[in-house]
Amino acid sequence: MKVLQEPTCVSDYMSISTCEWKMGGPTNCSAELRLLYQLVFQSSETHTCVPENNGGVGCVCHLLMDDVVSMDNYTLDLWAGQQLLWKGSFKPSEHVKPRAPGNLTVHTNVSDTVLLTWSNPYPPDNYLYNDLTYAVNIWNENDLADSRIHNVTYLKPTLRIPASTLKSGISYRARVRAWAQHYNTTWSEWSPSTKWYNSYREPFEQR
């Protein structure tokens, strides 16, 4: 049994790190493999993650590590029974992928403005809470070429766009993702998309 692609891990900097790797051939990850992880600290336990399949030769493990801080470092050991396949380490603060924003809502009750709001995926006491910026993707359901990205570089999880910048009588979808500049993170996954109908009509004298 051989590891084809070594484990790579990303942390949500809250409670979960996700590690993925590829084996040299088809593998029943949960039956054959175990990923052991331990915080490098004198009295820490070694926890065991039972991996799940991620494609024919791919495996994925979710490591539980509440209260992540910047100096935390974990040792990782990938075992197949009594055989050590790979040994490595992982510093969560250096490989952060934020959680996806949630509760994306579109408010169209103000006639000439579309207001999008969403929730910050972190609690206020988390280091990432005040460091997130967002990208909002809006697209025309009937014309995928009619798609745009709005960068939200302020802290408030809201975006206002003039309804007049969107085509009238068309259904649009939006989704949002996040990243944290000071932690040099990757982008989060996109939030689930939400749909609305743009019923805005230009005033008569502008037609």
Partner: antibody, heavy 129, light 109 residues
Amino acid sequence: EVQLVESGGGLVQPGGSLRLSCAASGFSSSSAHYMCWVRQAPGKGLEWIGCIYAGSRGSTYYASWAKGRFTISRDNSKNTVYLQMNSLRAEDTAVYYCARAAFVNRGVSWIWPYYFSLWGQGTLVTVSS
Amino acid sequence: IQMTQSPSSLSARVGDRVTITCQASEDIESYLAWYQQKPGKAPKLLIYRASTLAYGVPSRFSGSGSGRDFTLTISSLQPEDFATYYCLGSSYSTGSNIFGTGTKVTVLG
């Protein structure tokens, strides 16, 4: 220093109740591990009672014999774990230990405690009339 | 699960090699730990995951086995090793953590 300190033991009458406390210091009781209770009757072996996950998921597991009469809870703000014991019997007389445990997890919702690494000094519970 | 530990007691001299065994009633992979307990004290973790030495434990202690059969070996018994030893088996399939009945190691003679 990383340590666990149990308290609340003492003499209780059969049929009575008692709540034991386990105060953690030197580490956060809300970090990723289990907090467990183990007991030892005088001159006898060790017996697992149950565990509570100390992280954000708070799941509990109990030995089959302990379900119903024994309840484990936690107060992360006080870094303390509790063992509530009801309908006590003479055979519950034992030293009760608090212990921190490692776990096995599959995904993020299935987490099982599997060895006890750090132990408290124990507190004696005597059930007698 | 049930954990059958043997022997229940043994007598040995300083310098002796001591072996204690534990058998699980079902396959528990490597989810087995060994503990040392002295009178009036809390148990102390020696070995976890069947063969991994816990932090600060002398290298004369070793563990082996997987599945159902496990062994704790003390390669050269020291005066401070006279104590009771327990195995702990964990089965997440049946949802139990079960200790063995213990092995009391005493001074011969």
